[in-house]
């Protein structure tokens, strides 16, 4: 199956403090290789979660992604701040046998506005 | 079928105000992204400003910020761009353009309304 | 900003003949590309988006394509109406939106 990364929000919003998920999903997992969300695009991105194991404080992924056949890469981010505004981007890479993983595909970006807290 | 009719073009001197509409039909106005994009004599297209459908969400272009403002009446279906401190370089055909409700590009749009500033 | 550069400028060809129209970008835009015409007098009109789908209404003698940097729109066989001026626009790196300059396609 060709593969196709979406992520169907166009934008969320959050008030500050609390939580959000961005959804991402996958038409299929080939090529291997991993799947990175980052905000913001070009040399200013910023990496936010990848599907590799290491620890993110305050983003976790909301299905288990070791499991076989998962198509979803959806995260959550907690304890939303005014900082974490921003566009982010589900991407797709495959992994290179010696090189650097090359990015493939991406998803269209959530735009995450993050509002004032209700008093 | 969408009609996005654009009013309040004219002729005006530097540094006046000029507030220009967009009566929207044919949709459910409310639930879509909205967006100013402008076009100057001989030029091509420049994304102006936009906004969310609920209204609270907003951005502008740098070459306008601080001096237009975008707003809507959901229960008008209109939408409007208030524009202060005119300059020469603002002289363009106006157009309110109705995004697609999953990415930001532009289904509909309409004719146009044209600005002149000039002294 | 993502900078969209298309070339030519302008297109002089006759009726029945076959355009190709360049649209480049100053970083990868996946596919999150559209095209748009423009005809004097009249509200510009969505004719592809994802790069390469036709919008509803289309003619299929319009045909978009490419990925990442590099996309193309190809007219098959130009008829009258299609002398006009076209602009991509990415939708990827935003906002700010931003659309190429223009080609304007005229009759030779």
């Known amino acids: 199956k060709e593969l196709k990364v979406t992520q169907p929000e166009k934008s969320v919003s959050v008030a500050a403090g609390d939580s959000t998920v961005l959804n991402c999903t996958l038409t299929s997992l080939l090529p291997v290789g991993p799947i990175k969300w980052y905000r913001g695009v070009g040399q200013s991105r910023l990496l936010i979660y990848s599907f590799t194991g290491e620890h993110f404080p305050r983003v976790t992924n909301v299905s288990d992604a070791t499991k076989r056949n998962n198509m979803d890469f959806s995260i959550r981010i907690s304890n939303v701040t005014p900082e974490d505004a921003g566009t982010y981007y589900c991407v797709k890479f495959q992994k290179g046998p010696s090189e650097p993983d090359t990015e493939i595909q991406s998803g269209g970006g959530t735009e995450v506005y993050v509002l004032a807290k209700p008093s | 079928d969408v009609q996005l009719v654009e009013s309040g073009g004219g002729v005006v001197r530097p540094g006046e105000s000029l507030r220009l509409s967009c009566a929207a039909s044919?949709?459910?106005?409310?639930?879509?992204?909205m967006n100013w994009v402008r076009q100057a004599p001989g030029e091509g297209l420049e994304w102006v400003s936009l906004?969310?459908?609920?209204?609270?969400?907003?951005y502008y272009a740098d070459s306008v910020k601080g001096r237009f403002t975008i707003s809507r009446d959901n229960s008008k279906n209109t939408l409007y761009l208030q524009m202060n401190s005119l300059r020469a370089e603002d002289t363009a055909v106006y157009y309110c353009?109705?995004?697609?409700?999953?990415?930001?590009?532009?289904?509909?749009w309409g004719l146009g309304t044209l600005v002149t500033v000039s002294s | 900003e993502t900078v969209l550069t298309q070339s030519p400028g302008t297109l002089s060809l006759s009726p029945g003949e076959r355009a190709t129209l360049n649209c480049r970008a100053s970083q990868s835009v996946y596919s999150y590309l559209a095209w748009y015409q423009e005809r004097p007098g009249q509200a510009p009109r969505l004719l592809i988006y994802?790069?390469?789908t036709r919008a509803t209404g289309i003619p299929d003698r319009f045909s978009g394509s490419g990925s990442g940097t590099e996309f193309t729109l190809t007219i098959s066989s130009l008829e009258s109406d299609d002398f006009a001026v076209y602009y991509c626009?990415?939708?990827?790196?935003?906002?700010?939106?931003?659309f190429g300059g223009g080609t304007k396609v005229e009759i030779k």
């Open positions: 994802g790069a390469s």
């Open positions: 353009a109705k995004e697609n409700n999953r990415y930001r590009f532009f289904d509909d």
């Open positions: 044919g949709f459910t106005f409310s639930s879509y992204d």
């Open positions: 626009q990415q939708y990827y790196d935003r906002p700010p939106l931003t």
């Open positions: 906004i969310s459908g609920s209204g609270e969400i907003i």
